[in-house]
């Protein structure tokens, strides 16, 4: 799809990154068999895929997570994939909820999110989990991504 | 998308296969409500999709399985989307994970993986799970895909 | 993809509704950040995502549920993506199933579907689950969509 | 820090078999290729065999070929080598090594990590 200069396609798949910081906000990197189709998606600060042109894209993530019932707090580990447009205040488009293990000394799950959405020129989406000391970095485990329609 | 003569559309799913073989790769089979669109994209010997034009990529699998924490390996049940290219070895692109159930004689659960990948001629995707024999084949349970972009 | 008056863009994405029914077929809104590309692909009965246009279609939905393994049925909960096209019965394109979690008062899960499938003209697609009253309707976490290859 | 400890090697009568064990660590296992390396006393170093990084394409040495069969458990983290109807002339100190290569090749200078190796004894 997208075929043509004046259309071209516009992808990118990111691979999760560890972080130390302490924020909310997981951290991906252009490593291991990532995708970057062009200069129309770039990934920002290592935290958001930034799009340039209007349209409808399917964004989607995966976050794999290992956490147990007795060390974590009562509420489940969620992942939300939020959204950025410029001049507005950020917003949720998915999220996914799994309650954590009783497995010891953590159990590990997948949660995958996926949907279309309209994005403007210069919107932002990016991926915000409960507790991202929980997250998994093995290969493959998290990964971020986008294709335009 | 991929519209014309020279741009055909190029996609396919396809649908799990009880094997008694002891293989971790899934094997799959052409039947219920599949897809495949042409002989640009084709599935060999039931257990891998392979593509014919160089190109980006969705792909995603879902994989449902029944397992029980007492009866199995303390090891997560996982499910692995892996590449394999011409002259290259095998590489994985995507994983999940989920703890076996406590439940008896075993619990179901469910995992889907997806992304966007760049595959070149002749390139090959399949599905590969720690334990075979615990794959749920059930009308619409476990599948595989992919989408030319 | 499909650009041009000839060949637009098709894709839907549409926000759970709670319901008073008792039906297992989940109930969707065009509310929040939802989309409806052109009238190619209509929202019917807040039940059923309809298209106009034969093609290839990637369908995906994602549904969050609590459940209690004491307060539920034996039988996992079980979410069905159906299809149903004109003259024809409905039937299953795909299906995940999660056992019933063991935190109280309920644990939340998330379940993700998703495929390519041809559609006739006049095909509806539909989100079945086993215990609707289950479903989470927090922003982001039951979803459902399709967008055109 | 990647890892590599050989085990399982010693002392067998011609026609006898070992099995040789490397656990690894410091790396994610799966990512890579591995393979098995030898040096018999007074001579150069051989390769034997190699194994994909899911075990799905394994390579040997013809010296090797049908006596020898290399395996891997990721979940394990560890390699193996399968060693039947051994000869004198297997004698050797075994190595195991990771392989930075994406395609096979059985030069040597594509591992570019190893063990401290293991010695094999073949003789009555």
């Known amino acids: 799809m997208q075929k043509g200069d004046q259309n071209p396609q516009i992808a990118a798949h990111v691979i999760s990154e560890a972080s130390s910081k302490t924020t909310s906000v997981l951290q991906w990197a252009e490593k291991g068999y990532y995708t970057m189709s062009n200069n129309l998606v770039t990934l920002e600060n290592g935290k958001q895929l930034t799009v340039k042109r209007q349209g409808l894209y399917y964004i989607y993530a995966q976050v794999t997570f290992c956490s147990n019932r007795e060390a974590s707090s009562q509420a489940p580990f969620i992942a939300s994939l939020c959204l950025k447009s410029p001049g507005r205040f950020e917003r949720i488009l998915l999220r996914a909820a799994n309650t954590h293990s009783s497995a010891k000394p953590c159990g590990q799950q997948s949660i995958h999110l996926g949907g279309v959405f309209e994005l403007q020129p210069g919107a932002s989406v990016f991926v915000n989990v409960t507790d991202p000391s929980q997250v998994s970095h093995g290969t493959g485990f998290t990964s971020f991504g986008l294709l335009k329609l | 998308m991929q519209k014309g003569d020279q741009n055909p559309q190029i996609a396919a799913h396809v649908i799990s296969e009880a094997s008694s073989k002891t293989t971790s790769v899934l094997q799959w089979a052409e039947k219920g409500y599949y897809t495949m669109s042409n002989n640009l994209v084709t599935l060999e010997n039931g257990k891998q999709l392979t593509v014919k034009r160089q190109g980006l990529y969705y792909i995603y699998a879902q994989v449902t399985f029944c397992s029980n924490r007492e009866a199995s390996s303390q090891a997560p049940f996982i499910a692995s989307l892996c590449l394999k290219s011409p002259g290259r070895f095998e590489r994985i692109l995507l994983r999940a994970a989920n703890t076996h159930s406590s439940a008896k004689p075993c619990g179901q659960q469910s995992i889907h993986l997806g992304g966007v990948f760049e595959l070149q001629p002749g390139a090959s995707v399949f599905v590969n799970v720690t334990d075979p024999s615990q794959v749920s084949h059930g009308t619409g349970f476990t599948s595989f895909g992919l989408l030319k972009l | 993809m499909q650009k041009g008056d000839q060949n637009p863009q098709i894709a839907a994405h549409v926000i759970s509704e709670a319901s008073s029914k008792t039906t297992s077929v989940l109930q969707w809104a065009e509310k929040g950040y939802y989309t409806m590309s052109n009238n190619l692909v209509t929202l019917e009965n807040g039940k059923q995502l309809t298209v106009k246009r034969q093609g290839l279609y990637y369908i995906y939905a994602q549904v969050t549920f609590c459940s209690n393994r004491e307060a539920s049925s034996q039988a996992p909960f079980i979410a069905s993506l159906c299809l149903k096209s004109p003259g024809r019965f409905e039937r299953i394109l795909l299906r995940a199933a999660n056992t019933h979690s063991s935190a109280k008062p309920c644990g939340q899960q998330s379940i993700h579907l998703g495929g390519v499938f041809e559609l006739q003209p006049g095909a509806s697609v539909f989100v079945n689950v086993t215990d609707p009253s289950q479903v989470s309707h927090g922003t982001g976490f039951t979803s459902f969509g399709l967008l055109k290859l | 820090e990647v890892q590599l400890l050989e085990s399982g090697g010693g002392l067998v009568q011609p026609g006898g078999s070992l099995r040789l064990s490397c656990a690894a660590s410091?790396?994610?296992?799966?990512?890579?290729?591995m393979g098995w390396v030898r040096q018999a006393p007074g001579k150069g170093l051989e390769w034997v065999s190699t194994?994909?990084?899911?075990?799905?394409?394994?390579y040997y040495a013809d010296s090797v070929k049908g006596r020898f069969t290399i395996s891997r458990d990721n979940s394990k983290n560890t390699l193996y080598l399968q060693m039947n109807s051994l000869r004198a002339e297997d004698t050797a100190v075994y190595y195991c090594?990771?392989?930075?290569?994406?395609?096979?090749?059985?030069?040597?200078?594509?591992?570019?990590?190893w063990g401290q190796g293991t010695l094999v004894t073949v003789s009555s």
């Open positions: 410091g790396f994610t296992f799966l990512d890579y290729a």
């Open positions: 194994i994909s990084p899911m075990g799905m394409g394994t």
């Open positions: 090594a990771k392989s930075s290569a994406i395609s096979f090749t059985s030069d040597i200078s594509n591992f570019d990590y």
